[in-house]
């Protein structure tokens, strides 16, 4: 330096040579080696930038600084000897820091932590895998919802933390042999109804569902106010009873009593009580037509209303009733006559014979249930000679066809009226409450008593009237043969039916009436 | 031949519970409602409630409902009554019998004496 | 609830006599039954459905009535039949009995 001066206006980071020239500080370089202009700056050299001499050596990070530079290990790496900064490879002493070793919590749960040369992984558990916005944070995988499809259509997946498991869907089990939860589960459905895991009332009849089961009326049975059918907790009531009253507009004091027996033995009725309600109701019923009482005085059209009523209740009743027995073949017989005859069955494929002390009834099995129906199937033929009082002077309608056949071979209707009642009136019920037209005839013979010579013999059914009373009928029921005591008749449907005769002189020998037994 | 067999004379103490059972024979045991009726000494017969073994309904007169208890176990044939909260007045011979409406109660078991004494 | 009224409540009666007795009902009933009761026994059933007689009952009981009233006959006594006689409606719920008429030895 000149003992002549040194130059004041020497720019930042320089110091000045002589009076007239600057030079930069160590560290900092200008554009020309000696500065002559206070113009000129001196600005800082990045002795870390590529083409720089300085190498700290491996596993560091040169640090650039104003005027000078750092070497300081890379992280995940410290020096050995301790210091933080150096200035050269040879001064580097870096190597590779465990922080596996020094944070065993470094990975949280479901992971584990692997060093690697200047960091560390997380390698997640099966199960798990790397959160992506927090690579070190293993979470659950869904593998219910990831698409994989783990498990097998009978099952569903149920993810747990971790790991997730096949359970049969609820009404399902494994199949004999496989687990119940790894993914090689194979499930089927059980059978609640047979197994007896169901919770139907015993109002209803089980139906079993895949993976599940539903609870239906009993036949003849309703569900209970508000409450729907086929549901899980469907309650219902029986119908057998409620619709059962006093004919409208029929006064009789025996007939409300006889209805207040009905009505009672509804009111507890269960199906185990089916039989002995049966009998009671039948037993009721002899009674009530061995002393009508006050029914004897009302008007005739008014007693065939209440018969007709009665029939058609009956009818109802005994085949709502029926369902509910054990299968077997029931003979029930009263004092004034009344008889029953019931046989209930598995569906069978055979004919059925019903044989009572007055009549026979023969029909096809496969007419009984309807199809779709789980019931068993039932027939039933009921006698019920005391209706006899009742359906006095009943009428008897005749499809035009018939009626003019009787006048061509008869001279007539005789003056004294209505036909005679030979034989019991008897009911035919089936389980199937469809009976308008049988795919089968169903075929009836009566014994009766002796046939007035020259009158002719029909066969005939009640046919309920709009009116809610009705009048003998012979649509659809044929006279296939008749003997003085005995006649057989086929019908093509089924309803109550007797044997009449008519009050027709016949001319002649009349070969219809022959005997065809 | 139809058999109600009840169980031993109880002695209780007021306040406390006891549970009688009729055990039915030579019937379809859910063919019947199952009544039970009590006798208080001297005094005529008191209807208690009936058990349906068919499928559980029970009935009870209101003097007991919520105090007595009918029950019946279809696999072994036997219905039960439990009274609850025994009062002295409860001392009487309890009866269990097969019931039907149109029937009445045809048959009757032997009585279980109940002693309510403290 | 059907409350049953027998009277009379104690009546007395020789072996020969014709005995009646009768059950009223505050509502209409149509199923009457009547049970016979003796001391320290069990009752038994004895009349049902107004008048049908039980198994082993003989015929000198019978029974009758409607609605309201109900009455219950022995044609002739016999020393046998002195006992406690209840009727039983099971019409309505609840169930109930009649308090009894007691029949004693003249």
């Known amino acids: 330096q000149d003992s002549r001066g040194c130059a004041r206006w020497c720019p930042q980071d320089s110091s000045c040579v002589n009076a007239t020239a600057c030079r930069c500080n160590p560290g900092f370089s200008s554009f020309s080696e000696i500065i002559t202009t206070p113009m000129e700056t001196c600005d800082d050299i990045n002795e870390c930038a590529t083409l720089s001499k300085v190498s700290c050596g491996k596993f560091s990070d040169c640090w650039n600084t104003e005027g000078s530079y750092d070497c300081v290990c890379s992280p995940g790496y410290e020096p050995v000897s301790g210091a933080k900064t150096f200035k050269n490879e040879s001064e580097n002493t870096c190597q590779d820091v465990d922080e596996c070793q020094q944070n065993p919590r470094l990975c949280k749960s479901y992971g584990t932590c692997v060093n690697t040369l200047g960091s560390y992984t997380c390698q997640c558990l099966p199960g798990f895998k790397l959160k992506p916005e927090d690579p070190k944070l293993c979470t659950d995988v869904n593998e219910c919802t990831s698409g994989q499809n783990p498990c097998h259509s009978s099952t569903h997946c149920l993810n747990n933390v971790g790991s997730y498991q096949c359970r049969c869907r609820p009404g399902w089990q494994p199949i004999p042999g496989s687990p119940n939860g790894p993914n090689n589960t194979v499930c089927e459905d059980v059978d609640e109804c047979s197994s007896g895991q169901h919770q139907c009332d015993s109002s209803t009849v089980c139906f079993n569902t895949v993976g599940s089961y539903s609870c239906r009326c009993r036949p003849g049975w309703k569900p209970r106010h508000g409450i729907p059918n086929n549901q899980k907790d469907t309650v219902c009531e029986d119908m057998t009873f409620s619709t059962w009253t006093p004919p409208p507009g029929v006064h009789s004091q025996t007939l409300s009593r006889f209805f207040d027996k009905v009505q009672d033995l509804g009111r507890d009725y269960k199906p185990g009580l089916a039989n002995n309600t049966i009998q009671s109701i039948l037993q009721a019923l002899d009674e009530l037509l061995e002393a009508p009482g006050d029914l004897e005085t009302l008007p005739r059209l008014q007693q065939h209303c209440v018969a007709s009523h009665l029939l058609d209740g009956l009818e109802d009743v005994l085949r709502g009733l029926s369902k509910n027995l054990s299968n077997g073949l029931l003979n029930f017989s009263y004092p004034a006559g009344t008889e029953l005859s019931l046989e209930v069955q598995k569906q069978v494929d055979r004919s059925v014979t019903l044989r009572q002390n007055q009549a026979v009834m023969q029909l096809d099995w496969n007419q009984a249930q309807k199809s779709g129906d789980p019931g068993p199937s039932v027939v039933g033929l009921v006698s019920i000679p005391g209706m006899g009082k009742l359906l006095a002077e009943a009428p008897l309608v005749l499809e035009p066809e018939k009626q003019m056949l009787l006048h061509e071979t008869h001279q007539g209707l005789l003056q004294d009226g209505s036909p005679i009642l030979l034989s019991d009136v008897i009911s035919a019920f089936l389980s199937n409450n469809d009976t308008q037209n049988l795919s089968s005839p169903v075929t009836f013979t009566f014994s009766h008593r002796s046939v007035i010579p020259r009158q002719k013999v029909l066969c005939v059914f009640w046919e309920h009237g709009q009116n809610g009373c009705g009048h003998w009928a012979t649509t659809g029921c044929s006279t296939i043969g008749t003997r003085d005591t005995s006649t057989i008749c086929r019908c093509t449907h089924l309803s109550s039916f007797a044997v009449l005769m008519a009050h027709y002189d016949v001319q002649e020998e009349d070969p219809v009436l022959t005997v065809i037994t | 031949q139809v058999q109600l067999q009840q169980s031993g004379a109880e002695v209780k103490k007021p306040g406390a519970s006891v549970k009688l059972s009729c055990k039915a024979s030579?019937?379809?045991?859910?063919?019947?409602?199952m009544q039970w009726i009590r006798q208080a000494p001297g005094q005529g017969l008191e209807w208690i409630g009936a058990v349906y073994p068919g499928d559980g309904d029970t009935r009870y007169t209101q003097k007991f409902q919520g105090r007595a208890t009918l029950t019946a176990d279809t696999s072994i044939s036997t219905a039960y009554m439990e009274v609850s909260r025994l009062r002295s007045d409860d001392t009487a011979v309890y009866y269990c019998?097969?019931?039907?409406?149109?029937?009445?109660?045809?048959?009757w078991g032997q009585g279980t004496t109940v002693t309510v004494s403290s | 609830e059907i409350v049953l009224t027998q009277s009379p409540a104690t009546m007395s009666a020789s072996p020969g006599e014709r005995v009646t007795m009768s059950c009223s009902a505050s509502s209409s009933v149509s199923y009457m039954h009547w049970y016979q009761q003796k001391s320290g026994l069990s009752p038994k059933r004895w009349i049902y459905d107004t008048s049908k007689l039980a198994s082993g009952v003989p015929d000198r009981f019978s029974g009758s009535g409607s609605g309201t009233d109900y009455t219950f006959t022995i044609s002739r006594m016999e020393p046998e039949d002195f006992a406690t006689y209840y009727c039983q409606q099971w019409s309505s719920n609840p169930l109930t009995f009649g308090g009894g008429t007691k029949l004693e030895i003249k």
């Open positions: 030579g019937y379809t045991f859910t063919n019947y409602w």
């Open positions: 019998a097969r019931g039907f409406t149109a029937y009445g109660m045809d048959y």
